[in-house]
Interface confidence: low
């Protein structure tokens, strides 16, 4: 693979825990300049597999608030607006990175943590197991 | 609000950029012990709004590999297996945190970055604009 030369302006890495402990600038850079969240924010209501959003708050985590999707129905909404139980509403899950204060309650020391969150729901054809 | 006392064992915060620059332990703690990602891995194919997964790689970012969902159709798959254009397949997007090497190519210095990723697709009723 390509070896990228180390930048001579890098911070000092004398820390005995290097490279497991790194410096992170929390001044967030936002790459989402062309996105309009309002456009997608009503999908949870208009979907054939609608969901509700639940607030998950933890002051020892960054970000401290995460929104979790919970599918409203076991089935999916059909053209008549009724729940069709021949189809299934299922959560779409994603692993995300968060920062966990470590040691607890420390303002400037974190550990990287991976958590699974449900982002929304989709309608799938169920897997039918036929009994012989 | 509740004031959580500062832990006396916290690292030193004399850094002039504090609290914007923090120490982060990259030894990832994985909270997803009871999850089985295989269970949801076929939703992209079984959904009425199926999607493909595209690999997005960036060595200057942590995690360096992110999978992006792209909806296969403009419409949704109906009971006959055909695309129904009276409905729309739309991406469910989520803002996630990643670490960006800053300055570039530095092994131990990062900046927090927010990026928008498409996690999967859902089928929605379209918004119809009636022209008078």
């Amino acid at each position: 693979g390509i070896t990228i030369p180390r930048n001579p302006g890098c911070p000092n890495s004398e820390d005995k825990n290097f490279p497991r402990t790194v410096m992170v600038n929390l001044n967030i850079h936002n790459r989402n300049t062309n996105t309009n969240p309002k456009r997608s924010s009503d999908y949870y209501n208009r979907s054939t597999s609608p969901w509700n959003l639940h607030r998950n708050e933890d002051p020892e985590r960054y970000p401290s608030v995460i929104w979790e999707a919970k599918c409203r129905h076991l089935g999916c909404i059909n053209a008549d607006g009724n729940v069709d139980y021949h189809m299934n509403s299922v959560p779409i899950q994603q692993e995300i990175l968060v920062l966990r204060r470590e040691p607890p309650h420390c303002p400037n020391s974190f550990r990287l943590e991976k958590i699974l969150v449900s982002v929304g729901c989709t309608c799938v054809t169920p897997i039918v197991h036929h009994v012989a | 609000g509740i004031t959580i006392p500062r832990n006396p064992g916290c690292p030193n915060s004399e850094d002039k950029n504090f609290p914007r620059t923090v120490m982060v332990n990259l030894n990832i703690h994985n909270r997803n012990t009871n999850t089985n990602p295989k269970r949801s891995s076929d939703y992209y194919n079984r959904s009425t709004s199926p999607w493909n997964l595209h690999r997005n790689e960036d060595p200057e970012r942590y995690p360096s590999v992110i999978w992006e969902a792209k909806c296969r159709h403009l419409g949704c798959i109906n009971a006959d297996g055909n695309v129904d254009y009276h409905m729309n397949s739309v991406p469910i997007q989520q803002e996630i945190l990643v670490l960006r090497r800053e300055p570039p190519h530095c092994p131990n210095s990062f900046r927090l970055e927010k990026i928008l990723v498409s996690v999967g697709c859902t089928c929605v009723t379209p918004i119809v604009h009636h022209v008078a």
């Epitope: 969240p37 924010s41 607030r55 970000p63 | 609290p19 997007q93 945190l97 927010k114």
Partner: nanobody, 119 residues
């Protein structure tokens, strides 16, 4: 019920100043971090500034650092944004928001106040 009402927007020349205010009600204002967010014409939302519950910490997007100052008066349940050295690219609808900025959902929005920077 939660209400956020912004005011103070208007037309200003490049290099000029404005002070935006946000009057909050219906929740314990002093328990929440507050944000100013803006949306330029035809663009997505951009986080501008955040202030912690007690006003002890402020955070700014790079493009406004040194020009904008966020502040709050918990006794008056009010949030402010002092905008100096305004530029054409600061033209946007400015919203105050309660709650976390991550992910895309804020708890509550105000209705917004339009700031136009033009000569």
């Amino acid at each position: 019920q939660v209400q956020l009402v912004e005011s103070g927007g208007g037309l200003v020349q490049p290099g000029g100043s404005l002070r935006l205010s946000c009057a909050a009600s219906g929740f314990t204002f002093s328990s929440y971090g507050m944000y100013w967010v803006r949306q330029a014409p035809g663009k997505g939302l951009e986080w501008v500034a955040k202030i912690e519950q007690d006003g002890s910490e402020e955070y700014y997007v790079d493009s406004v650092k040194g020009r904008f100052t966020i502040s709050r008066d918990n006794a008056k349940n009010s949030l402010y944004l002092q905008m100096n050295s305004l530029r054409a690219e600061d033209t946007a609808v400015y919203y105050c928001a309660k709650g976390e900025i991550l992910p895309l959902y804020f708890d509550y929005w105000g209705q917004g106040t339009l700031v136009t920077v033009s000569s």
